[in-house]
């Protein structure tokens, strides 16, 4: 470690080539954790560039990533989950790159799933459900949700709505009636563990009634 | 070796404000989090904030929130952390410490003492 | 905030025999796993020093009579033959939630 240059410019001049970005996947296989990183350049050649991870790791010093055409991939049970870990870019065992990061900030949850929408007539409502891997995890069990949803027409605008349950309630008097609406949710680690949005969930398509129409679930 | 160098002993007024400075050296400084920790005469150990000299991003003990800034200096590997309006249970030794996960502190300053007293 | 709670204040122990410090937090300090407790040792005049984070890892360079159990609430740091140098005073400190907060300390002495 206490071979990098102090300056902060020469320190973010080395990372420029092969700046590379990283997210984690806990308990995303059983109890099996992953690990994926990327070169943030799409045209870095990536002949010969291995990525290797050390430190924070149970039993073993390091672990080799798996590449998968550009993006490169551990899946293990051995990541520690408290300390630092060192991610390298490495080429002919010679590290070009290293990053120091605690794999508890770069968790990403798996995308929400079945989305649904059902309209209820006696209480002029919406009530918006969805499904999501991480209620039965042993770790990332807290997330927060944004549920996004649009009038199709409306190709940018997008409203959200943050929450921490998996069920929500849009009032029928806040949509335009007769209007064909998508919606989709995603989410984010929100107790102790921190990283980035998941993949949004598929979209969900319902068309919302005149204002007089029979209940039941929409049709998609 | 890894190494934080603390600034020398103050000793400062009622309603003053303190700046105490932490030199990191031995590792590049961007990759840790430092923060402060102080400890009253005879007393236990309390966490004050800390901060991330790569973003520059801060986070405070609300008991301090409003007194307590700390900032980094990239160009010299070096954070501060000043605390205002000085009253005499500020009296403490301040310790600058290095995170080596969240958040536990693997390499600790010399400390400063910091005494107020009119 | 969570409150720590450390047993005993001070303890005497011979040379040789095994020293025993708990730690209670007033919620968990655990999810699954992972244990987001630590125990320091500080003498007189220093600083503290890290011995073992997430409740059970020995920090580097540190002798391997320390070590660390317990998860949820109830920690323990267990000294397995204490030495002359094993006198200080011991803290837990936890990390699951801002304030980051330490037990009030033990004074480990030589009976």
């Known amino acids: 470690e206490s071979g990098y240059a102090q300056n902060g410019d020469l320190e973010d001049a080395e990372l420029d080539d092969y700046s590379f970005s990283c997210y984690s996947q806990l308990e995303v296989n059983g109890s099996q954790h992953s690990l994926t990183c990327a070169f943030e350049d799409p045209d870095v050649n990536t002949t010969n560039l291995e990525f290797e991870i050390c430190g924070a790791l149970v039993e073993v010093k390091c672990l080799s990533f798996r590449k998968l055409q550009e993006i490169y991939f551990i899946e293990t049970k051995k990541f520690l989950l408290i300390g630092k870990s060192n991610i390298c870019v490495k080429v002919g065992g010679k590290s070009l790159t290293c990053k120091k990061i605690d794999l508890t900030t770069i968790v990403k949850p798996e995308a929400p799933f079945d989305l649904s929408v059902i309209y209820r007539e006696g209480a002029n409502d919406f009530v918006v459900t969805f499904n999501t891997s991480h209620l039965q995890k042993k770790y990332v069990k807290v997330l927060m949700h944004d549920v996004a949803y649009r009038q199709e027409k409306d190709e940018n605008k997008w409203m959200h709505v943050n929450l921490s349950s998996t069920k929500l309630t849009l009032l029928q008097r806040n949509l335009q009636p007769e209007a064909m609406y998508e919606i989709k949710v995603r989410s984010i680690p929100d107790h102790y563990f921190k990283g980035f949005w998941s993949e949004w969930s598929p979209s969900y398509y319902f068309r919302t009634p005149e204002i007089n129409n029979s209940p039941g679930e929409m049709d998609p | 070796q890894v190494q934080l160098v603390q600034s020398g002993a103050e000793v400062k007024k009622p309603g003053a404000s303190v700046k105490v400075s932490c030199k990191a050296s031995g590792y590049r400084f961007t990759d840790y989090e430092l923060h402060w920790v102080r400890q009253a005469p005879g007393q236990g150990l309390e966490w004050m904030g800390g901060i991330d000299p790569k973003t520059g991003g801060t986070a405070y003990n609300q008991k301090f929130k409003g007194r307590v800034t700390m900032t980094s200096d990239r160009s010299t590997s070096t954070v501060y952390m000043e605390l205002s309006s000085l009253r005499s249970e500020d009296t403490a030794v301040y310790y600058c410490a290095r995170s080596g996960g969240r958040w536990y502190f693997d390499v600790w300053g010399q400390g400063t003492t910091v005494t107020v007293s009119s | 905030d969570i409150v720590m709670t450390q047993s005993p204040d001070s303890l005497a122990v011979s040379l040789g025999e095994r020293a025993t410090i708990n730690c209670r937090t007033s919620e968990s300090v655990s999810i699954h796993l992972l244990h987001l407790m630590h125990w320091y040792q500080q003498k007189p005049g220093q600083p503290p020093k890290l011995l073992i984070y997430?409740?059970?890892n020995l920090e580097s360079g540190v002798p391997d009579r320390f070590s660390g159990s317990g998860s949820g609430t109830d920690f323990t740091l267990t000294i397995s033959s204490l030495q002359a140098e094993d006198v200080a005073v011991y803290y837990c400190?936890?990390?699951?939630?801002?304030?980051?907060?330490f037990g009030g300390g033990t004074k480990v002495e030589i009976k």
């Open positions: 400190q936890q990390s699951i939630k801002d304030p980051y907060t």
């Open positions: 997430g409740a059970s």
